[in-house]
């Protein structure tokens, strides 16, 4: 079974541009999590979904960040407008 699939693997953008990250969770998993990791702040949980419903988005209080999960097999994390301090590794994870 394929693991969690994210795209793009790398993204370079100019400040102020919109960035959209995509995630396909493991089939049959009903919880999906978006994390951000930086050297300065460590690993931060941004938002998680259960059965496609956002449960806790308190890790992204800036309304530049928005996440959606329109169905059980797809989620997006959007940053609009992006800022230099958004530079990080963004992880998607899923679980039963």
């Amino acid at each position: 079974d394929a693991g969690v699939i994210q795209s793009p693997r790398h993204e370079v953008t100019e400040m102020g541009q919109e960035v959209t990250l995509r995630c396909k969770p493991i089939s049959g998993h009903n919880s999906l999590f978006w994390y951000r990791q930086t050297m300065m702040r460590g690993l931060e949980l941004l938002i998680y979904f259960n059965n496609n419903v956002p449960i806790d988005d308190s890790g992204m209080p800036e309304d530049r960040f928005s996440a959606k999960m329109p169905n059980a097999s797809f989620s997006t994390l959007k940053i609009q407008p992006s800022e230099p301090r958004d530079s990080a590794v963004y992880f998607c994870a899923s679980s039963l």
Epitope: G42, E44, L45, S58, G59, M60, P61, E62, R64
Partner: antibody
């Protein structure tokens, strides 16, 4: 009914410290981000700090970084603000507020901090 | 930091008047949020995501705008509406407030 009750304010000398508390009830505290906001006498609102539900994401007003520390204890349904090296300009009513509707949907009644010699 | 400037800072009006308060951001924001505060009381959320009324807020309040300029409108002032109003942005930390608009009885 959502309730937020601040405590810990009082009179403190310049250079001193205080720890404010915010006791939450009427909602699942561990599911919500929380803010501190302050209001100096006769002045407007000033955002102070934010902490996410699991304490992983924390933000501070630039002018307060290094002196103020936000924290929470989800087992006690309580939010804290540790304030060190207090100055006269920190004199204000300090409010805690719940993050909801993308904003601050519930506020406490406030606790007064006075920094004076 | 994104500076929010409200205008006017003071506004005198009468019961039944239509009033508009403007909030201008030094940098573009995605949404604006509005609060009402009465003397000696905590602020109360009025409008979120620019135009959505918070639960229990009367329909005479409305919000609109985009980019750098947003407005709060009260269609017909009631006695209980005389208070100070603040806008706030959450697009980028720090989450700044406007300086406030004090609405007084004429």
């Amino acid at each position: 009914e959502v309730q937020l009750v601040e405590s810990g304010g009082g009179l403190v000398q310049p250079g001193g410290s205080l720890r404010l508390s915010c006791a939450a009830s009427g909602f699942t505290f561990s599911n919500f981000g929380m803010h501190w906001v302050r209001q100096a006498p006769g002045k407007g609102l000033e955002w102070v700090s934010y902490i996410s539900s699991g304490s992983q994401t924390i933000y501070y007003a630039d002018t307060l970084k290094g002196r103020f520390t936000i924290s929470r204890d989800n087992s006690k349904n309580t939010l804290y603000l540790q304030m060190n090296s207090l100055r006269a300009e920190d004199t204000a009513v300090y409010y805690c507020a719940r993050r909801g509707e993308g904003a601050m949907d519930y506020w406490g009644q406030g606790t007064t901090v006075t920094v004076s010699s | 930091d994104n500076q929010l400037t409200q205008s006017p800072s003071f506004l005198s009006a009468s019961v039944g008047d239509r009033v508009t308060i403007t909030c201008r951001a030094s940098s573009s924001v995605n949404y604006i949020y509005w609060y009402q505060q009465k003397p000696g009381k905590a602020p109360k959320l009025l409008i979120y995501y620019t135009s959505n009324l918070a639960p229990g807020v009367p329909s005479r309040f409305s919000g609109s705008g985009s980019g750098n300029e947003y407005t709060l409108t009260i269609s017909s002032l009631q006695p209980e509406d005389f208070a100070t109003y603040y806008c706030q942005q959450f697009t980028s930390s720090p989450f700044t407030f406007g300086q406030g608009t004090k609405l007084e009885i004429k």
